[in-house]
Interface confidence: medium
């Protein structure tokens, strides 16, 4: 399977909410011995590989923001901890998963990575990620709402297997 990022850049005004989205394309293994783990984290544009460094989003680590289930089930993060930080990650039945950030500040700007790990117990782990940039702007040049820029087909398939 692949992870695609429909949008590679989100430009948003301070105070707005933003929902960053990733999409799983292709078959994901199903069965009692398969676990799908999805999460989000901040990273930097590493020289070797994007998304290798894992930094917290609003002090929440990728472990705090994970979604964890078998197959393509819908899921949400534990609401209490994430919502206290104005965050919510969610997943639907169609391979889409997202993180919503409320009341954006300039400090939220950065490179966001979504991570999917397919665990086939007793066999292997397959790790895939996608990356997108969030720019939070303030002042007269800031847009009134979030403006999103579609990924080129080449950029949107950021595939890393493990």
């Amino acid at each position: 399977f692949k992870v695609t990022t429909p949008y590679s850049l989100y430009v948003c005004p301070e105070g707005q909410n933003a929902t960053l989205t990733c999409r799983i394309l292709g078959p994901v293994s199903k069965g009692h011995d398969v676990t799908i783990y999805k999460t989000w984290y901040l990273s930097s544009r590493g020289e070797v590989q994007m998304c290798s460094e894992r930094r917290p989003i609003r002090n929440l680590t990728f472990q705090d923001l994970h979604l964890h289930h078998g197959g393509h089930q819908a899921a949400n993060t534990s609401h209490d901890l994430a919502q206290r930080h104005g965050l919510e990650s969610a997943s639907d039945h169609h391979g889409n998963f997202s993180i919503t950030m409320r009341n954006l500040t300039l400090l939220d700007s950065g490179l966001y990575c979504c991570l999917v790990v397919e665990i086939r117990h007793h066999h292997s782990e397959h790790r895939v990620h996608g990356a997108m940039e969030l720019q939070v702007q303030t002042g007269k040049d800031a847009p009134s709402n979030c403006v999103v820029y579609p990924s080129s087909s080449q950029d949107s398939e950021n595939i890393t297997a493990a």
Epitope: T35, V48, Q63, H68, L115, V117, H121, H123, E125
Partner: antibody, heavy 118, light 106 residues
Framework: EVQLQQSGPELVKPGASMKISCKAS????????MNWVKQSHGKNLEWIGL????????SYNQKFKGKATLTVDKSSSTAYMELLSLTSEDSAVYYC???????????WGQGTSVTVSS | QIVLTQSPAIMSASPGEKVTMTCSAS?????MFWYQQKPGSSPRLLIY???NLASGVPLRFSGSGSGTSYSLTISRMEAEDAATYYC?????????FGSGTKLEIK
Amino acid sequence: EVQLQQSGPELVKPGASMKISCKASGFSFTGYTMNWVKQSHGKNLEWIGLISPYNGGTSYNQKFKGKATLTVDKSSSTAYMELLSLTSEDSAVYYCARRAYGYAMDYWGQGTSVTVSS
Amino acid sequence: QIVLTQSPAIMSASPGEKVTMTCSASSSVSYMFWYQQKPGSSPRLLIYDTSNLASGVPLRFSGSGSGTSYSLTISRMEAEDAATYYCQQWSSYPFTFGSGTKLEIK
């Protein structure tokens, strides 16, 4: 503060079985897998297996199937490893360690020393 | 299973000296992880995903590599770095560790 507190050292007789506990605190127990690692004679590390407190799912190193049984008690955030039909080869230090999927074992228990001797 | 071979098995270095140890995998792995263990203590995560420092790890440590060949480097040896270092892979079951490199201070 993240902590993994393991049960104390054990001296057991050959052929007996025993259970080691690993009590987790300071983090969401169901958000990680709990892994068990054997270290013999202060040298090589061997991965025994893992259990997901989220759904109770386990994965074992084939070498330890039938030797180790992993369980969890979510209500007390405790992982257990039972070692069966012990022999001198099982004398070692056993560690529990937490791991997030797609990551590494970032916190380890202090280790439980098991000595099998008649 | 994937066998990880570490070399050298034992090495010594003077304070301030650069140290490099290697980990060779019998099959290609996507990422390598490194742990440090001192006598009487539990292993400690040093490096994840081949080259990223775990929280609290000094900047003198670095990791690199790909495929079947990986290395851990200490830019300037310090006395507190004397320990045994293990590489480990999570790419395929069973997850395996290297046999360790024991680093001593001269």
